[in-house]
């Protein structure tokens, strides 16, 4: 299977006698390492004896040893991918073939390359575009098919035997595609470089020439012309004569036509070398050129500028700008025809002569109304005076002015009223044509400058309003200073901090957020009776009947607010306590009794201990008491205690009589 | 070590036949060439013919095409040369080679470069 062996490197490698070569070559022996390597010159296969005859240049040894004498040829591959190889130096009679012979652990392979060597250093080859134009880029390129290591080379550009300044880009290949030394010019010719010789000279390390290559520029351009002009000034009066010659001094490829071009426009008729112009006037005042063409496109020559001088014409006035805006810069320009250029300006403002305005432009650096009016110029040359001319009109535009915010209604406003404003100014250019009023809401214009406030509110503390045309004016705000009832009234304990206790020291404010007026009175009440006038009630000592539902009230001149009602809980002890029977305090033995702790107490009482005759303890710790069946002996008086977060309460003593059953007195 | 023994030589007359055999053995390779090569006294080496192992690809010297015959036996790593019409010229010592396969570019050389393994050698006299 003979696609064992893949092998890449170029066909054929070139160079000089004395120069080096360098071989890059890969290859792929599939079943494995190289094991020898011998490179012949000219390998012929000799059939009868199975070997090749011809000069071994190269030999490793399957043991890896190579013979000393081997300097010139180097074999700088390994065992497996690279099968690179160096001659250094070449010579003549290394040109024709080079034949790899190389040895795998399984097969054996013969690999040609062609190796060309010339007497002298061959010339690079020049490659040019195929149609070269003035001023367009064009790339220059220098081939030469060699490159080695041990062998440095350059390539230089001349143009004309001197050493172009453009930068050259040299590169260099040393690959299994290809071989060369490549010198690329970016270069744009212009129409002088035709004809012209360019070289590419190969030279050695140290600049030695070696070889080169050359070839002459054809540069195609358009025709080259010169303009000549009688008189040679070009300045003229009207009625003076002119003549214009054009002259070709280079074109490639042949010129075919020729045109005369005033201000970038063909001129009629006029199609050969000379052109005449008898009795000018002014309107033939202007930029002059001959133009001639060839295939490549056409050429001009340099502009005359012809100049046929007359007085100024009527002026006009060019404003920069109008309408203007108060406080900006506006610029007055004085426009005349005349040659030469006008010496000397008069301005007027609305008719009137401005005194010590003389130039073409007039300058005011800060306009103001007064400014507005109409603008008119006289401009003057060695040729005469012109004319006032219509003028222009200067409109200064500013935003209203005095722009005041006026209250309608009488005063003083009370919340739920309804406020009508309006917004005035003194003047303005452009006219008002809308009104903005801050802060915004959903308020009525019932007409323009006219806000109404319908229900105003007690939050309602100023109002601005705004005269716009192209810009707004801002009036100075004013207070509309709404008077309303005390607002968010409300009941607070200040004292005690905590819970409140019977006996404790309490006291109550009347709090509110705000009023206007700010005068106001207080009413204190629990239950419909008024119980004070100050903003704070007080009990030196709190009883638990006072406990209950309080407010408080804050009225002025526009009304009063009551707060919430406020509950006020007083916590106390279990007082008031006694024992209650049931069915009643006399029982008939065997029958059921249940003895029930009453009490007052806030908080409710969380424990009950009952307690016998003999102040005994016993061991039940409910509100009730539940004796069955009931005994004789139960007999006595009881008495309970309830305790609560607060503290300890007792009851009086009361008696339960059981007395003994008809079958227990029957039984006696 | 590869070890290549050959036998079947001896002395004929013109006309005679003979059959080489020729047994390799320490030869690990699956693919490889067998040849016989045959010195006359003051000739140099030279080719007589040549068979590939896994194709049976044949090659004869011209000088013998029509009258031997190489041919092998991959069982039992035998090659044979078969002698006809034997002519005092054949008379030499008759030496079988073995070796890898030999590519020189795209082509292929039946009868490889630089056989690397010989055998001693056995002799054929024709005589009269």
């Known amino acids: 299977d003979s696609s064992k062996w893949v092998f890449e490197h170029p066909e054929t490698l070139y160079a000089w006698e004395g120069a080096c070569v360098w071989i890059p070559c890969t290859y792929r022996a599939l079943d494995g390492d190289l094991e020898s390597f011998i490179l012949f010159h000219n390998p012929e296969y000799n059939k009868n004896t199975s070997k090749f005859d011809g000069t071994r240049l190269y030999e490793s040894t399957k043991d890896g040893k190579v013979p000393s004498e081997q300097k010139r040829v180097q074999f700088l591959g390994d065992k497996n991918k690279n099968c690179t190889l160096s001659i250094h130096p070449v010579h003549l009679n290394d040109s024709g073939q080079l034949g790899l012979r190389m040895e795998s652990k399984t097969e054996k392979w013969m690999e040609r390359i062609h190796l060309n060597v010339s007497e002298r250093p061959f010339p690079p080859h020049i490659q040019l575009p195929p149609e070269i134009q003035e001023s367009q880029e064009v790339t220059l390129t220098c081939l030469l098919n060699f490159s080695c290591y041990g062998y440095p080379i350059q390539l230089q550009w001349l143009l004309e035997g001197v050493p172009m300044r453009q930068a050259a880009v040299t590169s260099t290949s040393l690959t299994i595609k290809s071989v060369f030394t490549r010198s690329e010019l970016k270069f744009s010719p212009q129409w002088s470089h035709h004809g012209k010789i360019v070289t590419c000279q190969l030279q050695d390390a140290d600049g030695k020439f070696l070889s080169n290559d050359t070839v002459q520029l054809n540069v195609k351009h358009t025709p080259k012309l010169e303009i000549k002009v009688t008189p040679s000034d070009a300045i003229v009066r009207e009625g003076d004569s002119v003549t214009m010659t054009c002259e070709v001094s280079s074109s490639n490829p042949e010129y075919t036509t020729v045109s005369w071009l005033k201000d970038g426009t063909s001129l009629k008729k006029q199609n050969t070398f000379t052109l005449n112009l008898r009795e000018v006037t002014k309107d033939q005042s202007g930029k002059y050129c001959c133009q001639v063409s060839n295939d490549v496109g056409p050429g001009r020559s340099e502009e005359v500028f012809l100049q046929v001088q007359y007085a100024p014409e009527p002026s006009t006035v060019q404003i920069l700008h109008s309408p203007a805006v108060e406080g900006s810069q506006v610029e007055f320009l004085c426009m005349s025809l005349a040659n030469p250029l006008p010496t000397n300006y008069t301005w007027y403002h609305n008719g009137k002569e401005m005194q010590g305005r003389t130039e073409e432009k007039v300058h005011i650096p800060k306009i103001l109304p007064w400014h507005a009016g109409t603008y008119s110029c006289v401009a003057e040359n060695i040729l005469g005076t012109g004319q006032r001319g219509p003028g222009a009109e200067l409109d200064v535009q500013y935003p209203p002015k005095k722009v005041t915010t006026v209250i309608q209604n009488p005063m003083p406003i009370r919340e739920g009223d309804t406020v009508t404003l309006s917004c005035n100014y003194n003047s303005s250019n452009p006219s008002v044509t809308r009104y903005e009023w801050k802060p915004h809401g959903a308020w009525e214009e019932p007409s323009l400058g006219v806000l109404k406030i319908q229900n105003v509110g007690w939050d309602n503390t100023t109002i601005a309003c705004a005269a716009c045309n192209s810009w707004c004016s801002w009036a100075s705000p004013v207070a509309l200073n709404v008077q309303y009832a005390p607002r968010d009234v409300r009941v607070r304990k200040i004292k005690p901090l905590s819970e409140i206790h019977s006996g404790n020291s309490v006291s109550l404010q009347c709090d509110f957020s705000s009023s206007h007026p700010k005068e106001v009175q207080f009413f204190w009440e629990k239950n419909g009776r008024l119980l004070g006038k100050e903003s704070q009630l007080n009990f030196d000592s709190i009883s638990p009947e006072d406990a209950g539902s309080y407010s408080c009230w804050v009225n002025n001149s526009i009304g009063q607010t009551a707060s919430k009602a406020w509950t006020l809980e007083v916590l106390y002890a279990p007082r008031r306590l006694r024992v209650s029977m049931s069915p009643g305090d006399q029982v008939m033995e065997g029958k059921s009794a249940t003895l029930t702790c009453e009490s007052d107490a806030n908080p409710p009482v969380s424990h009950y201990t009952w307690f016998d005759w003999n102040n005994q303890s016993l061991p039940y710790h409910s509100q009730k008491l539940r004796l069955e069946p009931v005994k004789v002996q139960h007999s006595g008086a009881y008495w309970c205690q309830g305790t609560n977060s607060v503290g300890k309460g007792r009851s009086p003593l009361s008696t339960l009589t059981v007395y003994y059953s008809p079958e227990t007195i029957g039984r006696r | 070590q590869v070890q290549l023994v050959e036998s079947g030589g001896g002395v004929v007359r013109p006309g005679d036949s003979l059959r080489l055999s020729c047994t390799v053995s320490g030869f690990t390779l699956d693919y490889y060439v067998m040849g016989w090569f045959r010195q006359a006294p003051g000739k140099e080496r030279e080719v007589v013919s040549c068979i590939s192992s896994s194709d049976g690809v044949t090659y004869y010297a011209d000088s013998v095409k029509g009258r031997f015959t190489i041919s092998r036996d991959n069982a039992k790593n035998t090659v044979y040369l078969q002698m006809n019409s034997l002519k005092p010229e054949d008379t030499a010592i008759y030496y079988c080679?073995?070796?890898?396969?030999?590519?020189?570019?795209?082509?292929?050389?039946?009868?490889?470069?630089?056989?690397?393994?010989w055998g001693q050698g056995t002799q054929v006299t024709v005589s009269s």
């Open positions: 080679a073995v070796d890898k396969p030999f590519y020189d570019g795209g082509y292929y050389y039946t009868c490889p470069v630089d056989f690397d393994s």
